[in-house]
Interface confidence: medium
Amino acid sequence: ALDAAYCFRNVQDNCCLRPLYIDFKRDLGWKWIHEPKGYNANFCAGACPYLWSSDTQHSRVLSLYNTINPEASASPCCVSQDLEPLTILYYIGKTPKIEQLSNMIVKSCKCS
Amino acid sequence: ALDAAYCFRNVQDNCCLRPLYIDFKRDLGWKWIHEPKGYNANFCAGACPYLWSSDTQHSRVLSLYNTINPEASASPCCVSQDLEPLTILYYIGKTPKIEQLSNMIVKSCKCS
């Protein structure tokens, strides 16, 4: 799997999970989240050569097409596969609220 | 929806469905498929600016991060959303076989 266990231990030019820490205030301009101040969002990046973690039959076809066809601008892209939620604390007035924001943390990637 | 109805009628630099015809023999080197000779596979391409058909909360976060940090390489990518199967005819010896290959045709796109 193209997850932290594999990607963070290997120098990998191909599609893989990349570390990314996001500071809510600095990076997103969000001032409403009290805790945490930021989180390890991660992201997916890298090339998608033929059969590198292809998600669907279409992405396999596309990467093969990309190998054979000289134009090759139609290629699969490295995107998130498994995502996890993030629990946040914010305030409405003086009332603290705890909420789970779904699909905030990328855990693994795929070529789609 | 970023489908043919919208994308094929508009000149759109952002993430959209693009027409792509694939000839099995010429483009993939596949000689085993008897019919059809090729098909309209389509593909997804284009930029993913903030809130342009974002798939998940993470992709929304990423595109906002990318807007505030323009030098960042962490940005969402335009990929397939809805896919359809393709029915093919091939032969095992002299015996014709009809099979449905899943996820072969892209019908719409998203920023993920």
């Epitope: 090339a47 000289p70 134009e71 601008s73 892209c77 | 630099d13 693009r18 993913c48």
Partner: antibody
Amino acid sequence: EQQLVESGGGLVQPGGSLRLSCAVSGFSLSSYTVNWVRQAPGKGLEWIGYISYGGSAYYASWANGRFTISKDSAKNSVYLQMNSLRAEDTAVYFCARHMQVGGAPTGSMAAFDPWGPGTLVTVSS
Amino acid sequence: EAVLTQSPGTLSLSPGERATLSCQSSQSVYNNNYLSWFQQKPGQPPRLLIYGASTLTSGVPDRFSGSGSGTDFTLTISRLEPEDFAVYYCAGGYSGSSDKYAFGGGTKVEIK
């Protein structure tokens, strides 16, 4: 208007490195493939490689290993990193976009248009 | 690795005459028509004249025409104008994971 402009050329010693930039305007690098082509003084054109809209780079066999193409779509720039430079790498370096035909980035049939004006790289001691 | 051979190396003609330039590929270009023609004048980048072996680029005068398929291609200038004296290059697109493009050595069309 759709434009490409190269920069970063100059004099470099044999064995040295250089990074050329190709700044694009009027179109998105997320939708188009950009090529690098070079031309030695008084000689013909030579294809180096390209980077596709999706970020996949392809190279001529002679360029593989020494030359690396990358891009920063947010900065509207494509780069050509050249290492272990030799005298025979002296040339004008052009970036050129795949022309778009029929509403899709594919099917341009080896058509490069538009081109940048080029930047001269001289490898000499 | 494909090699494109252009002939003649130099063509000496007078304005008003017909010019016929040849481009021969050591292997078939992709789809038999991934062949372009470029015009280059001193100190300028190449200018695309014809793509897909025979399709004239927008703004190019119709005295230019291209023909051929597979491995043999021709660029014809029906009546040479003073501004047509330049160097002409053909470029081919090829299948495979490397050397997707190649340029011919060029033909110089000079005033007799």
